[in-house]
């Protein structure tokens, strides 16, 4: 349903999802700067707006676009459909709430009289509301309840901060002291689930958080003990860190999985193998490409694309992979829309000069390149070996890849086999007589 | 580290094309979008348009009708066409990474050097 | 399209000093703006971005806060680098990019 990937969205992006819309039912053919004309033609008159992604609905065979507001929706100026090419695109945003109007209109006035949304709450009886959040444009706390018990929500304890680099900036505690402290305070907070996982949440940064994002993604009931599980798992020292290693390097998609659903199960593994290790930002990426490339079965196109990168040494981050990925695969379903719609004619991107150079380079021989382990240079033979890597980045930084050198290893190329086919063959396995086989010997990145 | 660098002829004739290219290292041109922002000598700075790898364009409408934006992929470059161009086009030409979509804001984190272009006969 | 207008356009100032410049948008934007550097024959060096966030790498004394339609760009301690001409730029989707006219800070 459209509203539920509005809210999801807007979930995914921490964005207030009264200050963003979605247009859908956009067709399948029209382009990028028409559909910027017709959104600018719709929204324009109203408030300012961004668009922030576009994706492909299986359900209506037909494109989306996300829109964030300069300004909480106007019910009363906004559009429920916009004319567009094909016929009226639908205008979909989070349902009125009664509440808010008289909300805001009570906001306004105590503005004017000089007392804000705190001084109503007392006059209530709500002591027990959080003071930041009773100025928000509008506070559904003061929905609830006005004679609630107190709760430890108006001021609390805040947590330590933890962001899961293997060396911590000035300010961050180390996985063990934040840990204890989040243990010793978390049965104190008298409040919901949903504010428990806000404060834990508040308190990560970097790694982190981007791996509490991606499960938060994946499970939006996911609770905090199921958080902290998580977290111990990655960065706990219970596991043996060779087997962290070994976990992530016997890590294959499962039959049909999508290449981006493959990356989100794969990262927090692929954290948790690198954590506490000497490693290069970079290096973890090159590994997170080398590990996709020798695993995954993808189109000729994207695996061109993401050759063409570990032939450079330009290994994207987690979030441009992610984009890449995400980008191709909505390519594929809109290549795979138009092929149904108009069958045997018309060259799609499958006759350009792009995926025929995709197409070569998936068969090109491998290029072995020595790798150094991480404390000992001379190399060792292993199946499935992966380049080192240094400290670990945020996840989220704008910046790409910033140069810090990285090594490299061998890995086996998986061919463009079949969804389904385990990846060109586990760790530790024989290799077997087929194509791209061969007897070859990798580096041991992982030993220590 | 990324890095941009423009090139292209520094003189252009009135009512000729303008055509210049950003080539891009350090970097794949296939996850960012790229654009071309100038500033005539002593002015301020205009956006005049980016793209994407796929080779999605937006451009700014003051310009639209005389300007092309290509990609390249294999080689890692885009090009600006900037068609029947006039004393009022001379700027310096900066092309530079636009993060266009992130939810954090559509600016420009990497600039190349910049060329200057002088229109005149 | 949205304009963008910087005041002051020139400010003299000394090394250690608070400086604050000021962008209006001609519209409401949220807070979807950027902030940026040029010296001299040099390319424009992002600063602040999402009104208020540092882009890695920028000195703390920078800092950047508003809503609206209303911006500053503030730094807390002038340093012999920060003589230079600085620029906002709105991005609505709404409207082209654009950028205020740019705001020179030169030695006193």
């Known amino acids: 349903m459209a509203l539920t990937l509005l809210e999801d969205w807007c979930k995914g992006m921490d964005m207030d999802p009264r200050k963003a819309l979605l247009i859908v039912g956009i067709p399948m053919e029209c382009s990028e700067v028409e559909i910027q004309d017709t959104v600018k033609a719709g929204l324009q008159p109203l408030c300012a707006y961004r668009v922030l992604g576009r994706m492909f609905r299986r359900e209506d065979n037909a494109k989306a676009v996300f829109i964030e507001l300069a300004d909480t929706v106007n019910y009363t100026t906004l559009p429920s459909h916009i004319p567009g090419k094909g016929g009226s695109w639908e205008v979909v945003v989070k349902p009125r709430n009664p509440d808010d109007e008289f909300l805001s209109r009570l906001n306004y006035f105590l503005k004017d009289e000089g007392r804000s949304m705190t001084d109503v709450a007392r006059a209530l009886g709500c002591c027990s509301l959080p003071a930041e959040s009773l100025d928000a444009e509008v506070m559904p706390q003061v929905r609830s309840p006005p004679l609630e018990p107190p709760k430890e929500s108006m001021w609390y304890r805040k947590l330590k901060v933890f962001s899961g680099t293997a060396s911590p900036s000035p300010g961050e505690e180390t996985f063990e002291d934040w840990l204890e402290q989040v243990t010793e305070i978390m049965p104190i907070w008298q409040v919901s689930e949903v504010e428990k996982r806000r404060r834990l949440l508040e308190s990560l940064r970097g790694p982190a958080l981007s791996i509490m994002r991606v499960l938060q993604a994946n499970n939006d009931s996911i609770t905090v003990e199921q958080c902290l599980d998580a977290l111990k798992q990655i960065f706990g020292d219970k596991e043996d860190f060779r087997a962290s290693q070994f976990r992530f390097l016997q890590t294959s998609p499962k039959i049909g999985e999508k290449v981006s659903t493959f990356l989100l199960r794969l990262e927090p593994l692929l954290q948790k193998a690198v954590h506490k290790s000497p490693l290069s930002v970079r290096s973890t990426d090159m590994i997170r490409l080398k590990h996709l490339l020798a695993r995954v079965a993808m189109t000729p196109a994207l695996r061109g694309k993401l050759e063409l990168l570990d032939q450079r040494g330009c290994p994207p981050n987690f979030l441009e992979l992610m984009k890449l990925i995400r980008d191709e695969e909505e390519w594929e379903n809109t290549e795979a829309v138009m092929k149904n719609k108009e069958k045997p004619s018309g060259r799609g991107r499958g006759a350009s000069g792009r995926q025929a150079r995709a197409e070569a380079s998936v068969s090109a021989p491998q290029a072995t390149v020595q790798a150094r382990s991480f404390s000992d240079s001379s190399p060792q033979t292993i199946q499935g070996g992966l380049p080192p890597l240094v400290k670990r980045r945020r996840l989220l930084g704008s910046e790409s890849t910033r140069g810090e050198d990285h090594g490299q290893a061998t890995y086996p190329k998986a061919e463009n086999q079949t969804p389904g086919r385990e990846g060109p063959q586990a760790a530790g396995e024989e290799l077997g007589n087929e194509a791209g086989a061969g007897a070859m010997s990798h580096p041991k990145p992982w030993e220590t | 580290q990324v890095q941009l660098q423009e090139s292209g002829p520094g003189l252009v004739k009135p009512s000729e094309t303008l055509s210049l290219t950003c080539t891009v290292s350090g970097g794949s041109i296939s996850i960012y979008y790229w654009s071309w922002i100038r500033q005539p000598p002593g002015k301020g700075l205009e956006w005049i348009g980016y793209i994407y790898y796929s080779g999605s364009t937006n451009y700014n409408p003051s310009l639209k009708s005389r300007v092309t934006i290509s990609v390249d992929t294999s080689k890692n470059q885009f090009s600006l066409k900037l068609r029947s161009v006039t004393a009022a086009d001379t700027a310096v030409y900066y092309c530079?990474?636009?993060?266009?979509?992130?939810?954090?804001?559509?600016?420009?984190?990497?600039w190349g050097q910049g060329t200057l272009v002088t229109v005149s006969s | 399209d949205i304009q963008m207008t910087q005041s002051p356009s020139t400010l003299s100032a000394s090394v250690g000093d608070r400086v604050t410049i000021t962008c209006r948008a001609s519209q409401r934007i949220s807070n979807w703006l950027a902030w940026y550097q040029q010296t001299p024959g040099k390319a424009p060096k992002l600063l602040i971005y999402k009104a208020s966030s540092l882009e890695s790498g920028v000195p703390s004394r920078f800092s950047g806060s508003g809503s609206g339609t209303e911006f500053t760009l503030t730094i807390s301690s002038l340093q012999p680098d920060d003589f230079a001409t600085y620029y906002c730029q709105q991005y609505s989707s709404s409207s082209p990019r654009t950028f205020g006219q740019g705001t020179k800070v030169e030695i006193k």
């Open positions: 530079a990474r636009d993060t266009y979509g992130d939810p954090r804001g559509d600016y420009f984190d990497y």
